[in-house]
């Protein structure tokens, strides 16, 4: 697994560099997670032909994966810093159960899957420090998450491959939209 942000050799070799600001740390953390997703997608795409499937075909699924919408205030039209930040944190909290599902789905990238999961938890903590309106953030119900996890794990092999691919793609898209919005804040 790649070394977490802040622990690479460049950082060690440059001890007099200015410490990262909160925004820079968040930016670096998201890029680190995107690198992890990229590695996981490589293994998934090598194992199955899901990656060749059209977006339209893949959209026909009953997974309730978080997605950015106009009303969330993260796009240029209707951009709203506070609303957007709440959506990003809420969405990441909702993704956690899906990241848990990914944990036993990889053979050669098992460590990488764990790194993505743990880095996301750290990212949530960074963002919660940045948010002013923490009351607006709804945490998913643990019981609902547990039954969802059981249901996903009970799927046949083909559906599990499809689910893995969809989670990775949706999580990547969510992080990309989140980071683009955060770069405006």
């Amino acid at each position: 697994a790649p070394v977490p942000p802040g622990e690479d050799s460049k950082d060690v070799a440059a001890p007099h560099r200015q410490p990262l600001t909160s925004s820079e740390r968040i930016d670096k953390q998201i890029r680190y997670i995107l690198d992890g997703i990229s590695a996981l997608r490589k293994e998934t795409c090598n194992k199955s032909n899901m990656c060749e499937s059209s977006k339209e075909a893949l959209a026909e699924n009953n997974l309730n994966l978080p997605k950015m919408a106009e009303k969330d205030g993260c796009f240029q039209s209707g951009f709203n810093e506070e609303t957007c930040l709440v959506k990003i944190i809420t969405g990441l909290l909702e993704f956690e159960v899906y990241l848990e599902y990914l944990q036993n789905r990889f053979e050669s990238s098992e460590e990488q899957a764990r790194a993505v999961q743990m880095s996301t938890k750290v990212l949530i903590q960074f963002l919660q420090k940045k948010a002013k309106n923490l009351d607006a953030i709804t945490t998913p119900d643990p019981t609902t998450n547990a039954s969802l996890l059981t249901k996903l794990q009970a799927q046949n092999q083909w559906l599990q491959d499809m689910t893995t691919h969809l989670i990775l793609r949706s999580f990547k898209e969510f992080l990309q939209s989140s980071l683009r919005a955060l770069r405006q804040m």
């Epitope: 796009f75 898209e173 990309q176 980071l179 683009r180 770069r183 405006q184």
Partner: nanobody, 124 residues
């Protein structure tokens, strides 16, 4: 890194239109975000617009909002900047830049590959 080539620049009268293209032969270009920046003589390079890996995620500088449109055709490995209602103050060298994370942003540091630029001149 990807090699980027801009084209479509030229001279146009105020109120006219131009369509810039940013092309690469890189085969995973669809996964990159692409930004357009411009630099007028004696001025800093400034952000114009960008488009994410997800084509619906577009952002514009306030000075071009409603006049410029960024789009992408991944089958042709090309990103376009349609510039309408051009003004003399739009005169600059226009550069395209790519971000391998598919995110983009309004600062030059977010991009890892740059083109050589194409000149746009708006005057009567």
């Amino acid at each position: 890194e990807v090699q980027l080539v801009e084209s479509g620049g030229g001279w146009v009268q105020p109120g006219g239109s131009l369509k810039l293209s940013c092309t690469t032969s890189g085969r995973r270009f669809s996964e990159y975000a692409v930004g357009w920046f411009r630099q007028a003589p004696g001025k800093e390079r400034e952000f114009v617009a960008d488009i994410g890996e997800q084509a619906e995620n577009t952002w514009y500088a306030h000075s071009v909002l409603g006049r410029f449109t960024i789009s992408r055709d991944d089958a042709k490995n090309t990103v376009y900047l349609q510039m309408d209602s051009l003004k003399p103050e739009d005169t600059a060298v226009y550069y395209c830049a790519a971000d391998k994370y598919g995110v983009g942003g309004n600062a030059q540091g977010y991009y890892d590959s740059w083109g050589q630029g194409t000149q746009v001149t708006v005057s009567s």
